[in-house]
Structures are given as C-alpha cells and as structure tokens.
C-alpha cells in the first residue's frame, strides 16, 4: 500500500448532501483517523 498523502488526496463527505457539500473535496483526513487510506492509484494525486 502506498503512503497516504494528506496534502494531495482529498475527500468529500458522503452524507452531507450535494447542496451542503457543494461537490467540494476538502483536504482533510478520512472520517476515521486510523483507517487505511485508499489504495487506488487514481485517487492519489501526487503534488509535483
């Protein structure tokens, strides 16, 4: 598994609702701080 890059990956609240989340992907931790980070390459955007 790749290291989780808090700077580069971003997440949107699942339950907030479209008008409240405004489709924004906030650069915050996943909801559970000890949870494994996603491993899909397409969800890891490395800052150049």
């Amino acid at each position: 598994m790749e290291d989780f890059n808090m700077e580069s990956d971003s997440f949107e609240d699942f339950w907030k609702g479209e008008d409240l989340s405004n489709y924004s992907y906030s650069s915050t931790l996943p909801p559970f701080l000890l949870d494994a980070a996603p491993c899909e390459p397409e969800s890891l955007e490395i800052n150049k």
């Epitope: 990956d9 971003s10 997440f11 949107e12 609240d13 699942f14 339950w15 907030k16 609702g17 479209e18 008008d19 409240l20 992907y25 915050t28 931790l29 996943p30 909801p31 559970f32 701080l33 000890l34 949870d35 996603p38 899909e40 397409e42 969800s43």
Partner: antibody, heavy 120, light 116 residues
C-alpha cells in the same frame, strides 16, 4: 479495520425514549457526518438525520424534528441518537452510517444495526 | 406520488444483464441529481454500490465490482443500475436514494431474484 459498533437491542414502552450508541472501533470520529437511518420490518431505509462529530452540528429530517436528538462524545469516539415519545410504528432496526468519497471511489461504513421494539 | 419509484421485484437468470430503474417524480429532473444505489441482504445493513449523475460525475463503492454500473434515462426521468454477468450472490434488495430538499430520500426497493 474501522467498524461502527452499535449498542444492543431495546424493548420500549410507547411514550418512552430510547438512546442508541454508535462507537467507532479502531478509529477516531472526525469531521464527516454520521447519519442515522432506520428500517422498519419489510420496509426500505428511512433517513433520520446526521450529526457532524467535529462540531456537533445536526441536520434532522423534518419528520423527526422535535423527537430526535443526535449527540456525540468525541473523547470515546461515540455518537448517540435519542428518539422520544416512542410509538409502535417506531419499531425498526436503527443504523448509524458514515463515509467519504474521493474523486473515483466512495467508502461507506455502517453499524450492525440496533433493533428497537416499541410495544405495550 | 413517491419521490422515487422502483419496481417491487425482478428476476433473471445467472449470467444475464439486468437493469434496475429508479424513476423520479414528475418535476424532479434526474439530470440534476446524483443517484445513489445500495444493495441489502437479509440481516445486514445496506451496502453502498455506486452513485451516478453523469459519466464525469460517478463514483464506485469501495470493493464493488465493475459489473455494477450506473446510468440514467433522461426520457424516462430515471436512474439505472446495471448489473452484468448476474451471479447468485446478487440476489438481494436494491435501493436508490437521492439528496432532495435537504433530506435523503430512499426508493421503496427492488427485490432481485436470481433464478436457478
């Protein structure tokens, strides 16, 4: 692996209240909403509302406003849902759920459910 | 009239492709909503499968195989869950949901039976 672990089944009298807990086992609640969803026997899910564990802010479904209270205790990574003035038609399995989405994937977490039976 | 309407039941054979529909009430345009799809098996909580608004705004659930996909039928004002290569383990209830008027609204569900 993080899990949402809920409190056990409850049997309540009409007019009373029930408080269901939802603990993040193996992780810490963060800023993403925890929703409460109930499901009566043989029926589809029904959303009750959510709480932001970080701020404590809530958003209740109109149907439950005035009867539901959602709280959290971040020190023990636990969210609570209290439903008052119970009626027989509140008999249902109550779930807590949370999750987040990246641009390509969504990750959802559900508790195992708590059966609340309202009967005289 | 319900906000979301789903056929109550559907049956198909293993290996087939099936389309489950979620029709939005008249006046609610499917193109404006992300349609969420859940699978639920007896005794378990719903499991998120995917959400679909357009080909550029879609997300798959974690661990959900690609044979589950979403689309929409604008002429029918409906969201569609397509399951290809149907398997016996796909037998379950399927629910759609949308965020509408500041609340989550679920459809009544479709019971999918895998024959044989």
């Amino acid at each position: 692996q993080v899990q949402l672990v809920q409190s056990g089944a409850e049997v309540k009298k009409p007019g009373s209240s029930v408080k269901v807990s939802c603990k993040a086992s193996g992780g810490t609640l963060s800023s993403y909403a925890i929703s409460w969803v109930r499901q009566a026997p043989g029926q589809g899910p029904e959303w009750m509302g959510w709480i932001n564990p970080n701020s404590g802010g809530t958003n209740y479904a109109q149907k439950f406003q005035g009867r539901v209270t959602m709280t959290r205790d971040t020190s023990i990574s636990t969210a609570y849902m209290e439903l008052s003035r119970l009626r027989p038609d509140d008999t249902a399995v109550y779930y807590c759920a949370s999750g987040y989405c990246s641009r390509s994937r969504c990750y959802d977490y559900w508790g195992q459910g708590t059966l609340v039976t309202v009967s005289s | 009239q319900a906000v979301l309407t789903q056929p109550s039941s559907l049956s198909a054979s293993p290996g087939a492709s099936v389309s489950l529909t979620c029709t939005l009430r008249s006046g609610i345009n499917v193109g404006a909503y992300r349609i969420y799809w859940y699978q639920q098996k007896p005794g378990s909580p719903p499991q998120f499968l995917l959400r679909y608004k357009s080909d550029s705004d879609k997300q798959q659930g974690s661990g959900v195989p690609s044979r589950f996909s979403g689309s929409r039928d604008a002429s029918a004002n409906a969201g569609i869950l397509l399951i290809s290569g149907l398997r016996s383990e796909d037998e379950a209830d399927y629910y759609c949901a949308i965020w509408h008027s500041s609340a989550w609204v679920f459809g009544g569900g479709t019971q999918l039976t895998v024959l044989g």
